[in-house]
Amino acid sequence: AITEAREEAKPYPLFPGPFPGSLQTDHTPLLSLPHASGYQPALMFSPTQPGRPHTGNVAIPQVTSVESKPLPPLAFKHTVGHIILSEHKGVKFNCSISVPNIYQDTTISWWKDGKELLGAHHAITQFYPDDEVTAIIASFSITSVQRSDNGSYICKMKINNEEIVSDPIYIEVQGLPHFTKQPESMNVTRNTAFNLTCQAVGPPEPVNIFWVQNSSRVNEQPEKSPSVLTVPGLTEMAVFSCEAHNDKGLTVSKGVQINIKAIPSPPTEVSIRNSTAHSILISWVPGFDGYSPFRNCSIQVKEADPLSNGSVMIFNTSALPHLYQIKQLQALANYSIGVSCMNEIGWSAVSPWILASTTEGAPSVAPLNVTVFLNESSDNVDIRWMKPPTKQQDGELVGYRISHVWQSAGISKELLEEVGQNGSRARISVQVHNATCTVRIAAVTRGGVGPFSDPVKIFIPAHGWVDYAPSSTPAPGNADPVLII
């Protein structure tokens, strides 16, 4: 514990001189800034060296005294300039100054590399007052030094807005080499040269580097840090590390794996996410990339029908997001689908093939050759057509939808008829005489209603007209036919 001396007693030795080594044991300081821990540092450096007082940073404070009294110059005593110690050791160093008591207002602080050390935990300031002079020792201790404690430490005393600065004390923390750059894992092309870099620092310097490949040293002679290892090429995976040596010992870097790029493994788990009449959405899990990023993927689609010609459709897509919608497929058809992906080395094998089916769709074309004629005796309109080609039915026909629109003197009326799938004719009752009837027909499957045929018009005369003739779907490009009877 720090005890206080008798405040008016004056037994304390003054600077300059072998201070504080010559202090008698009962000469305890008047004041102190306590150390946070009671740790006794492993190294203690005396604040002074015998000989001349330090004159490098002498300050004669510019104070205009009421009675113009001159103030003597002040300077910190010389102290040890350079402290070298091992990591995790303790250190204590100090600066000292004798301040005449007429300097009634001073502050003392520690700075490291130009920044004030604000924490009080390391600092202890002791005062040894005498009648005319107060000796001040400002000590700084570090219990377990780290590399970050390296630097230049100074004391600053501020008096009347003037600063007195001590000589710097350089702290050099020595330890095992510390890596600033370690080799990085790489993926390389077979038999292609590549470089690895290793850099480590002390202190102490120099730091020498040995390279290790698969537990065997590569270089017989060490290289000074930093070191670049050029590997002419590999045919198989290898693990590299570097050893950094200095006078304190050896540090080994992390081991890094150098992989040889290869073609990817085939994708796995190709699955159907959604099917429509003409498209299938698939997803897949990419296989191992062969240590080289995927560039793109290829979706191969072939008809599963044994009677098909076996041709394969190929769709190319980006490697991400492992999802693709295959379009332009036939409705109600079976397909085999496989996926292959590539990296810079080449294409993977194709994934296991999966079977997928499109659903039933609405027909893609209208019924053909629609003809309409008036059966005046029964007051009906007869309609005939041909079913769409099987391939374009996109499903199993369940019937037809007939739209007939009756127009007369500004009045228009549309009616819809549903007809079963058998046959290709229908009869509808005349709704209005002296009117135009416009007929359109669409094929229907369970997948929906297909497009309507082009309109066919027929004029229904007033009762008593004799002549009539059929009206039919026009040839492409012709105007809508109108038959007047």
Epitope: E7, L31, P34, N101, Y103, D105, T107, I108, F127, E132
Partner: antibody
Framework: QVQLVQSGSELKKPGASVKVSCKAS????????MNWVRQAPGQGLEWMGW????????TYADDFKGRFVFSLDTSVSTAYLQISSLKAEDTAVYYC?????????????WGQGTLVTVSS | DIQMTQSPSSLSASVGDRVTITCRAS??????VAWYQQKPGKAPKRLIY???NRHTGVPSRFSGSGSGTEFTLTISNLQPEDFATYYC?????????FGGGTKLEIK
């Protein structure tokens, strides 16, 4: 031994002036600065400022700039506090307090205090 | 200016008790804190300087601790003569500033 002896109580009218003295003994007067501290009735301590007893240079806290003057007579080891244009709110006990060693600004010895009462 | 916030403002305790008074600085004042005891009608009396050092003649039951912004004065085994008002003072930066005081009363 160190002693700081202050002048006796004062009763003043508003607008008047008062000068409080603080006589030091038992140490070298010019080696320690002198602080002045005010304590209004029932209130806490308030640092007014200090005077460098070697150079005679005063330093005032912001609230005590203007009507308050610190001065010295080193021949008789005495510090003075003068307050002019007294106001009722200047009623307080005024203490002188010796500054501790250089590089530590706390007070190690105090005067017994002087009660200044301002009343019409 | 550096504010010194002292707590509690008053405290009741019995002889033999242990009490702690706290001062919080509004910025880092290192260990530049002193503690004073004042009895009614008397000048303050010095107790602790530089946060943790007892002045000559101050009983060992008074102890101070802290650095930076948090400081405490502890009185163990309270004696009848310890009932008084206690003040902290930061003397790191001008203007010097006191805490508001803690009045220690007999329970």
């Amino acid at each position: 031994q160190v002693q700081l002896v202050q002048s006796g109580s004062e009763l003043k009218k508003p607008g008047a002036s008062v000068k409080v003295s603080c006589k030091a003994s038992g140490y070298t007067f010019t080696n320690h600065g002198m602080n002045w501290v005010r304590q209004a009735p029932g209130q806490g301590l308030e640092w007014m400022g200090w005077i460098n007893t070697y150079t005679g240079e005063p330093t005032y806290a912001d609230d005590f700039k203007g009507r308050f003057v610190f001065s010295l007579d080193t021949s008789v080891s005495t510090a003075y506090l003068q307050i002019s244009s007294l106001k009722a709110e200047d009623t307080a006990v005024y203490y002188c307090a010796r500054k501790g060693v250089t590089a530590a600004r706390y007070f190690d010895y105090w005067g017994q205090g002087t009660l200044v009462t301002v009343s019409s | 200016d550096i504010q010194m916030t002292q707590s509690p403002s008053s405290l009741s305790a019995s002889v033999g008790d242990r009490v702690t008074i706290t001062c919080r600085a509004s910025q880092n004042v290192r260990t530049a804190v002193a503690w004073y005891q004042q009895k009614p009608g008397k000048a303050p009396k010095r107790l602790i300087y530089l946060a943790s050092n007892r002045h000559t003649g101050v009983p060992s039951r008074f102890s101070g601790s802290g650095s930076g912004t948090e400081f405490t004065l502890t009185i163990s085994n309270l004696q009848p003569e310890d009932f008084a008002t206690y003040y902290c003072l930061q003397h790191w930066n001008y203007p010097l500033t006191f805490g508001g005081g803690t009045k220690l009363e007999i329970k």
